[in-house]
């Protein structure tokens, strides 16, 4: 039969989409407006840089680490930009509606779309657990949703515990991680006979993965300190991240060949395994003191992603039909946990060493932080799994996950498969 | 040495508009946060605004938001305050003050290092 | 909402002096100490708490956590008399309303 979509979702998906812009467009319309205040052109440069690396890592760097799966790698790249394009616009308006709206109109800044493009990063990463098993239509519902989530959490966390734009942002990585793992486990999950080679990755798309995780490397110190207020802060964020990164790839390359009985190196544990040291440091890199520090959390941290990536993805396959390839979410998760904890650990130790007696109110503030952050991650996750489900999203059927030919145009092929 | 100068005060009637410059000299502004603190005669000091190193956030006072805007030139290495609608609950000495940062439990402690002498603003009818 | 007290005292030469600080909520050591003459601009004493700026005398300390902090002057110097300002960097920047240290 003739790959292309159904025809309800040929209706269904460019209204829904087109509509949405056109609400976007009215609400932008309405109630934004620039940022008129003077501002030098030197310090405009300099703040566009970091937005621009970030938004080099979301398209580049994430759309391109998805894009393994040997029949499935257009989709991965290009719904990727999609939901990207589409996460940045309403994460502006949601983070604009969320704290500045009582005073009239948002006003849009550089920091504004750093943010959203920061947002937007979330969904990406969460997207890993279900590519391949959902349609553009579906994954519309999943951005919005995911989005709204993500802008919630930070601000209850930043009005209840007070936290600042990085440490309220940080808890992405967590937070990305269970919301996408949560949405995964109400998909379908097994795979129909005939379809598994479908789920393999090949040595192309997977160079292009490799290609990504590169440009993830190169800038991740650039997303761990985006957020933060002063040089110094910005400049111990960017050391220990690239020290962490560094030793999570020699780690990561190191340790995939130990877990081979042949001691050969596995292109997936290596994909993901090279961002582990970045992950892991997000939450304290402006606070570790010292290179050694951040160097070993990268060697623990590239330590447990190739571990994870050996012995975790039998169990994700089975329970939330996860495919082998499609490691970033359990990575996330158990990364994301290890930053929290690495965290905790130096607020106990500064505490300890500063003879302060707040130290049972501080470490309570930070895992009320990380568990509201889990439970609203896995709520909104299973809220985003069951509307997935819907009829009305014309989901692709078992038969045709990760395919490439039932979304896109290819002259070459007269059929499909 | 580093110093701050602040300039463009004086009256100004009520409603009206002010631009206050502060002129940094012995650092340069692209690397330092900066904020703009206020006094009225005969009370305490009222933080009105603050412009990160990178001038990429802004953040201002409840009782001046949407009124005064803090913005900055690196290549005059000068800090502004442009105030409108001014009432007389306005009037104060206005300082500039360099935002300095030092690592603290869990999170970073900011405080006010450098301070400039202060230029007076009046608003009356 | 950030309470200094007193608000003013009267001492005299070689007096110790304690100046207090409450916050409404922890701000965990995120406080800091101004030193205010009449017609002057304010000049910083000690950040982060207890860490005192450089070039400010010793006699000068300052202590606490949470919602609790105190700055004490050991043996009053006549150049101290002036008002002094608690300052919180925990979330947006406030101030205290000042302490007048007063010669009795």
């Known amino acids: 039969m003739s790959s292309k979509y159904p025809r309800s979702v040929r209706r269904c998906l460019p209204l829904w989409a087109l509509t949405l812009e056109a609400a976007l467009i009215l609400l932008f319309y309405f109630f934004t407006h620039y940022d008129a205040s003077l501002e030098d052109q030197k310090g405009l440069v300099a703040s566009y840089q970091v937005g621009q690396d970030l938004t080099v890592m979301a398209a580049i760097g994430l759309g391109f680490l998805t894009s393994s799966f040997r029949r499935h790698s257009w989709s991965s790249v290009a719904f990727n930009l999609f939901m990207l394009a589409l996460g940045v616009q309403w994460a502006i308006l949601l983070d604009g509606f969320l704290s500045q709206f009582p005073s009239g109109k948002v006003v849009i800044t550089l920091f504004s779309i750093r943010l959203a493009t920061m947002s937007a990063l979330s969904v990406l990463i969460s997207v890993d657990a279900v590519l391949g098993k959902v349609n553009l239509a579906q994954l519309v519902v999943m951005v919005l949703v995911e989005v709204t989530a993500l802008g919630n959490l930070r601000m209850v966390i930043s009005n209840i515990f007070n936290t600042d734009y990085h440490m309220n942002m940080m808890h992405i990585y967590v937070f990305a991680a269970y919301f996408g793992l949560s949405v995964a486990w109400c998909l379908p999950k097994p795979l129909p006979e005939g379809t598994e080679d479908k789920d393999q990755t090949a040595t192309i798309p997977s160079l292009s993965a490799m290609l990504g995780a590169l440009f993830l490397w190169m800038f991740w110190p650039s997303f761990n300190s985006a957020l933060l207020r002063s040089p110094i802060e910005r400049k111990n964020a960017v050391f220990n991240t690239y020290y962490a990164v560094a030793v999570s790839v020699v780690t990561a390359i190191s340790g995939s060949s130990l877990a081979h009985p042949q001691g050969k190196i596995s292109k997936t544990y290596v994909h993901s395994a090279v961002l582990a040291g970045g992950v892991a440091v997000g939450t304290s890199c402006h606070l570790i003191p010292s290179p050694w520090l951040a160097m070993v959390l990268g060697l623990v941290a590239g330590l447990i992603s190739v571990g994870g990536a050996k012995y975790l993805p039998g169990c994700c396959n089975r329970v939330l039909g996860i495919p082998h390839s499609s490691i970033m979410g359990y990575n996330f998760s158990l990364l994301g946990l290890l930053g929290e904890i690495i965290y905790i650990v130096l607020l106990v130790l500064d505490t300890v060493g500063a003879g302060n007696g707040m130290i049972g109110f501080q470490v309570l503030l930070s895992i009320g932080e990380l568990s509201l952050a889990i439970v609203i991650a896995l709520m909104s996750g299973l809220l985003t799994g069951l509307l997935l489900n819907l009829k009305i999203w014309k989901a692709p059927h078992e038969a045709k996950y990760f395919d490439d030919q039932v979304f896109w145009k290819f002259p070459h092929l007269a059929v499909g498969f | 040495q580093v110093k701050l100068l602040e300039s463009g005060g004086g009256v100004v009637q009520p409603g009206g508009s002010l631009r206050l410059s502060c002129e940094a000299s012995?650092?340069?502004?692209?690397?330092?946060?900066m904020h703009w603190v206020r006094q009225a005669p005969g009370k305490g000091l009222e933080w009105v605004a603050l412009?990160?190193?990178?001038?990429?956030?802004?953040s201002y006072a409840e009782s001046v938001k949407g009124r005064f805007t803090i913005s900055r030139d690196t290549s005059k290495n000068t800090l502004y305050l442009q105030m409108r609608s001014l009432s007389a609950d306005d009037t104060a000495v206005y300082y500039c003050?360099?935002?300095?940062?030092?690592?603290?439990?869990?999170?970073?402690?900011?405080?006010?290092?450098?301070w400039g002498k202060g230029t007076t603003v009046t608003v009356s009818s | 909402v950030m309470t200094q007290s007193p608000s003013s005292l009267s001492a005299s030469v070689g007096d110790r002096v304690t100046i207090t600080c409450r916050t409404s909520?922890?701000?965990?050591?995120?406080l800091n100490w101004y030193q205010q003459k009449p017609g002057k601009a304010p000049k910083l004493l000690i950040y982060?708490?207890?860490s005192l700026q450089s070039g400010v005398p010793s006699r000068f300390s300052g202590s606490g956590s949470g919602t609790d902090f105190t700055l004490t002057i050991n043996s009053l110097q006549p150049e101290d008399f002036a008002t002094y300002y608690c300052?919180?960097?925990?979330?947006?920047?406030?101030f205290g309303q000042g302490t007048k240290v007063e010669i009795k």
């Open positions: 003050a360099r935002d300095k940062a030092v690592r603290g439990i869990s999170r970073y402690n900011y405080y006010m290092d450098v």
């Open positions: 412009i990160w190193f990178d001038g990429s956030i802004r």
């Open positions: 909520q922890t701000i965990s050591r995120n």
């Open positions: 012995g650092f340069t502004l692209r690397s330092s946060g």
């Open positions: 982060a708490t207890s």
């Open positions: 300052q919180q960097s925990y979330t947006t920047p406030s």
